[in-house]
């Protein structure tokens, strides 16, 4: 008799990443009988919610339901109806909501309450919405990339899944850049983690990991730009800010009230003799780089060594996956290739920033001007953060791998978060059965 396919014995999970600039919904799928195996969970869908991050809904919380509708309806379509009730849904909010909570717990709670009520209206198994800590964000990002790279598997392969995968079992470090924060997470080599706040201990698949992590709140690309503008306007002689981080010919009016809206600019706040100022781009990479460096306080370090702002950072070790905005920005700038040296990246950035704004607009006609205008700053910021902030060098630059997806799953904290909450990463190595259950009879 002919083999007949049995109904797929699969499970699904949904995680919403409520970031500072936008929300994305991820749908994951895995074979039910293999949920403790490493590398079996994969992403089947990403749905980017149209609109800003949830922290921007403070004044219009009633619009949150509509905002989430399209992606939640997409999840309803992708996941078979028979699976809806047992599909967990998690929402994790990151630095944008941490900043809102810092200003007001009441406003942050109100946004989350409305989010929870909206998500509870769907047929899935809603597990709650919460603000995750920076430490969690870093840790789950590290778990995600190492899970997808097969680093937790005890079976050493003779082949590589992805081009930059080394065949050893050394884990990759994780570099995550968002709009409001950035995380660095890795296993240091025989180094004591001098600051308890930055130390994590994991036992995964029978192996112990001592992991360093830190989340730099306000050092995501968008908040770093607000910081830089607030710092530079302090010394401007009038309401014109000649800015090297924007293309020559670029002009934009900024409200001072918007500049001081975020806790990130608090240290630069001052009474200005104007309500608005105009950014006028002059497009100079070197000057932009110098201005960005002023955001990193390297004059004080209470440990054997620091990143910046007195935060402990052990010596860098091994390869790193740089994802989220590290990847999106470098991808746009066409600088993600393994073959591009740090010197070459700097050279390309110098040329890119010097290009006139009118020329840039013509070359990238399909890109929203708001995003397009900020690539010079963002690219320069990435270089400054990696080199001066985290102490990568021209030599160690080749250990940074700009990653968007690994085997079809986005690099980011969401997969690690779901694996943890669904208990799919066992502390001990599961006993492997001689034959896995076949889906055919």
């Amino acid at each position: 008799t002919q083999n007949k396919a049995l109904p797929e014995n699969v499970k699904y999970g949904i995680v919403l990443d409520a970031g500072s600039s936008h929300t994305s919904l991820y749908i994951y799928k895995w074979p039910a009988e293999k949920e403790n195996d490493t590398g079996v969970v994969h992403q089947v869908e990403e749905c980017r919610v149209k609109g800003p991050g949830i922290s921007k809904f403070v004044q219009k919380v009633n619009a949150i339901g509509i905002y989430l509708t399209a992606c939640m309806e997409r999840a309803r379509e992708v996941i078979p109806r028979s699976q809806h009730q047992e599909t967990p849904v998690y929402l994790g909010a990151t630095a944008g909501m941490r900043l809102l909570r810092m200003e007001s717990e009441e406003l942050a709670d109100r946004v989350l309450d409305v989010v929870e009520r909206s998500l509870s209206n769907y047929p899935f198994d809603f597990q709650g919405a919460r603000i995750i800590t920076g430490q969690e964000e870093g840790a789950y990002g590290w778990i995600t990339i190492n899970y997808l790279l097969g680093k937790f598997s005890q079976k050493t392969r003779w082949f590589s899944i992805v081009p930059y995968e080394t065949n050893n079992q050394e884990t990759f470090g994780a570099l995550d850049l968002g709009g409001a924060s950035t995380q660095v997470t890795f296993v240091p080599q025989n180094q004591t983690i001098e600051s308890p706040d930055n130390a994590l201990q994991f036992r995964l698949y029978g192996k112990d990991y001592n992991v360093y992590t830190h989340s730099f709140l306000c050092y995501g690309k968008d908040q770093a730009l607000w910081q830089k503008l607030a710092k530079d306007i302090q010394v401007a002689s009038n309401e014109i800010l000649r800015d090297p981080c924007f293309h020559p010919g670029y002009k934009k009016v900024v409200n001072v009230s918007d500049l001081y809206k975020t806790p990130c600019t608090k240290r630069f706040e001052m009474t200005l003799p104007f309500q608005q100022f105009e950014i006028q781009g002059i497009g100079n990479y070197q000057q932009c780089h110098q201005s960005i460096l002023e955001l990193f306080n390297t004059s004080y370090c209470p440990y054997s060594q620091c990143a910046f702002n007195g935060i402990f950072l052990p010596p860098l070790q091994g390869d790193f996956g740089a994802f989220s905005a590290f990847y999106f920005v470098m991808k746009f700038l066409n600088l993600t290739s393994e073959k591009v040296s740090q010197e070459k990246v700097t050279e390309m950035m110098k040329k890119f920033c010097a290009q006139p704004w009118e020329e840039i607009k013509t070359s990238y006609a399909g890109v929203k001007e708001k995003y397009l205008s900020e690539y010079c700053f963002s690219g320069t910021y990435i270089l400054s953060l990696l080199l001066q902030g985290y102490h990568f060098t021209a030599d160690s630059w080749e250990h940074i791998h700009f990653i968007g997806k690994i085997q079809g799953s986005d690099a980011g904290w969401t997969l690690g978060y779901m694996l943890n909450l669904t208990n799919m990463i066992p502390a001990e190595q599961p006993l492997s059965t001689p034959l896995s259950h076949s889906t055919y009879v």
């Epitope: 909570r101 200003e103 007001s104 717990e105 806790p263």
Partner: antibody, heavy 116, light 111 residues
């Protein structure tokens, strides 16, 4: 659990300065602002100001501006308040409190006595 | 500055009865659909303890007999039934705008 541990009582002379501390534990220190509150005669509560531990930026009640300085040491997770040019009016209990707009956690207070 | 007027200044209530303390703000303390009004209990030698936040939400571990209500400029704290342990000073506070301000306090005792 969240705890705020304040430094001990101070007896200071008029015109002098005092610097008190507030050591935080049980949460990410840089994720919340630290406020300072004065309580005189066991009744009147006055908000002095707050500091953003993340970057050291601060906001004050105009009444205390110029006389109070708020600082933090993020590596030791400690907030400090210095009060200068003290008079007998400054004899009070001073509290640190964690929060954005919700003061859910308070230190036990530092009693300052200004006396010649 | 927003002035908070608390009344009465002192109050004596029998065990099991209801205690009502009111707090009036010189201008609305509502913003974005939230009332930035808080109630604290303070016992001698202790720091204030958060009872109510956002005008009507109970703080962590606060007994259900403490109820907050109101919006805009008029707020009240109700304690029912009154227990011996409720003898304390009670303060309202607004954090809608800087400078954050407190009411003058109400001394609650047992009759």
């Amino acid at each position: 659990e969240v705890q705020l541990q304040q430094s001990g009582p101070e007896l200071v002379k008029p015109g002098a300065s005092v610097k008190m501390s507030c050591k935080a534990s049980g949460y990410t220190f840089t994720d919340y602002n630290m406020h300072w509150v004065k309580q005189s005669h066991g009744r009147t509560l006055e908000w002095i100001g707050y500091i953003v531990p993340l970057n050291g930026g601060s906001t004050f009640n105009q009444k205390f501006k110029g006389r109070a300085t708020l600082t933090v040491n993020t590596s030791s997770r400690t907030a400090y308040m210095e009060l200068r040019s003290l008079t007998s009016e400054d004899s009070a209990a001073y509290y640190c409190a964690r929060g954005g707009t919700r003061f859910a956690y308070w230190g036990q207070g530092t009693l300052v006595t200004v006396s010649a | 500055d927003i002035v908070l007027t608390q009344s009465p200044a002192s109050l004596a209530v029998s065990l099991g009865q209801r205690a009502t303390i009111s707090c009036r703000a010189s201008e609305s303390v509502d913003n974005f659909g939230v009332s930035f009004m808080y109630w604290f209990q303070q016992k001698p030698g202790q720091p204030p303890n958060l009872l109510i936040y956002g005008a009507s939400n109970q703080g962590s571990g606060v007994p259900a007999r403490f109820r907050g209500s109101g919006s805009g400029t008029d707020f009240s704290l109700n304690i029912h039934p009154m227990e011996a342990d409720d003898t304390a000073m009670y303060f309202c506070q607004q954090t809608k705008e800087v400078p954050y301000t407190f009411g003058g306090g109400t001394k609650l005792e047992i009759k």
